[in-house]
Interface confidence: low
Amino acid sequence: FSGDGRAIWSKNPNFTPVNESQLFLYDTFPKNFFWGIGTGALQVEGSWKKDGKGPSIWDHFIHTHLKNVSSTNGSSDSYIFLEKDLSALDFIGVSFYQFSISWPRLFPDGIVTVANAKGLQYYSTLLDALVLRNIEPIVTLYHWDLPLALQEKYGGWKNDTIIDIFNDYATYCFQMFGDRVKYWITIHNPYLVAWHGYGTGMHAPGEKGNLAAVYTVGHNLIKAHSKVWHNYNTHFRPHQKGWLSITLGSHWIEPNRSENTMDIFKCQQSMVSVLGWFANPIHGDGDYPEGMRKKLFSVLPIFSEAEKHEMRGTADFFAFSFGPNNFKPLNTMAKMGQNVSLNLREALNWIKLEYNNPRILIAENGWFTDSRVKTEDTTAIYMMKNFLSQVLQAIRLDEIRVFGYTAWSLLDGFEWQDAYTIRRGLFYVDFNSKQKERKPKSSAHYYKQIIRENGFSL
């Protein structure tokens, strides 16, 4: 329950819920553990204005803010080389593929009228191919590529008009794809959408410094998610029988002084201000965390009692993202002067305590390598082994209900403000080549082995 996560940082064995610490655990994951891998449409599809696709805020942002990037026209060209992506998925042997739909590829100006036929065909073909391979699709409706027209006409997520427009788009996706999709994600990491899109200006649409806008955007994202959940729950779940959530991302943090209660309070405040901002309304009591309401009363919108009731419980599982985008650069306000840490196990324990031990899908996890690293990505293997070991310990030692893991990412691609200077794929792509071959990196071989053995064998 709210505030209980503080116990994670207590070094007193009577308080800490992290039962047993060991460097490594040789064990298997639960029998039907859900192994997968993910991509984001804008990062890998390319073809940013091909076949009737409309521009997104990121296409615009790239041309106006990232001067050294020609466009996402290159990228990994997944729109063109769908078969190559499918072969890569076959190679690894995943149970699911998490990908996002490009909203402006379906509806060029964002408004749901007649869908762009070529866009519809692309996603339909992809879904059919996954079903044929017995690979479960996990589909994200919004991974940051808002149709530019909606930004220009309404001011994007600052305007609550977008909520209904997003719901219309979601309805269309449920109608067209819901027969093949059992797992839906509404929005990927809304914290970054709000904070970097409207606070630091590092993400599209690149607006800076308006704290009221940051929290208005967050508010509208939560309300949009909730509306879509209720829509799915009422109109689609009865016959499609799927699940729907929102991917929430966070860092982890450790106190400067491990025995210092005020530093521990700051760590709690840090987690609450990032993860709790979105998790509390959706997975908690339907409202913003108490501390945020008090400290941000002048800029944080208010949920009415009816809205709190509407927000509460609008996720069928806890989709959690833990990767570099929440760490670099971390909002200094969120750090509270404490030390960031890559301890995924403790972050999962925090979620367990704060939100009453939910079922958790790790919806994004992984690290990055320098763009010059090709297929010998030893650092990525080290990081993956470390993260997976922490997940396994969370499951086996802490009884946390993690049911699936999404390695990020399938392919090298466009990495937001880092553009093409880093790589996150398990498959190497030479962006300058015509054929964009997917070459398995060492990490792809490693992940393949983990999946085959369902964990770590001695």
Partner: antibody
């Protein structure tokens, strides 16, 4: 009903050591959301915070008095003890203990229950 | 260390509104608590976390906090409100409790 009661000597001599005890009831000192502070108030003057003990046994002391203070607790007896060495007439004051409660996870909601105070005079 | 500044005294006629301020560097980012102390008695918490009231405290007592000033507002002041009022914060940097110097409220 939550209560705190201070006890200790009414009179101490300069250079002596003062030991004050705060006995609590209605809540447990092991509760992860509870802490206890000692505060004093010289006659006609403002409140001055002295020390705090957190539920996990962490302690915090006033910078100006840090070298003279020791706070501790005995959970089984529901007592918090403050020891103040090298007493001086300027330490003459009413000494209070007060409870702080954590809610919302990461800050204290003020001192919601106070003892009635014990008056200590330092004189030879 | 963190310093909280209060006016030594505030006077107000019965039925009027009293405002007692507490100044501190960027105090708006801290949680401020207010105590009432009547002569010969222990302090009583009247407002916590800037603006919340403990049970039993009349609605006439309210608080606000932004920028460099926190304010305790007592509306429709009564003779029984005459007391010393102290603001308090936890200074997270030093891990210390800090009290203001106190304000004597006189009801004319």
């Amino acid at each position: 009903q939550v209560t705190l009661k201070e006890s200790g000597p009414v009179l101490v001599k300069p250079t002596e050591t003062l030991t004050l005890t705060c006995t609590v009831s209605g809540f447990s000192l092991s509760n992860a959301r509870m802490g206890v502070s000692w505060i004093r108030q010289p006659p006609g003057k403002a409140l001055e915070w002295l020390a705090h003990i957190f539920s996990n046994d962490e302690k915090s002391y006033s910078t100006s008095l840090k070298n003279r203070l020791t706070i501790s607790k005995d959970t089984s007896k529901s007592q918090v003890v403050l020891i103040m060495t090298n007493m001086d007439p300027v330490d003459t004051a009413t000494y209070y203990c007060a409870r702080s409660v954590v809610t919302g996870g990461y800050y204290y909601d003020g001192m919601d229950v106070w003892g009635q105070g014990t008056t200590v005079t330092v004189s030879s | 260390s963190y310093v909280l500044t209060q006016p030594p005294s505030v006077s107000v006629a019965p039925g009027q509104t009293a405002r007692i301020t507490c100044g501190g560097n960027n105090i708006g980012s801290e949680s401020v608590h207010w105590y009432q102390q009547k002569p010969g008695q222990a302090p009583v918490l009247v407002v916590y976390d800037d603006s919340d009231r403990p049970s039993g405290i009349p609605e006439r007592f309210s608080g606000s906090n932004s920028g460099n000033t926190a304010t305790l507002t007592i509306s429709r002041v009564e003779a029984g409100d005459e007391a010393d009022y102290y603001c308090q914060v936890w200074d997270g940097n030093s891990d210390h409790v800090v009290f203001g110097g106190g304000t004597k409220l006189t009801v004319l």
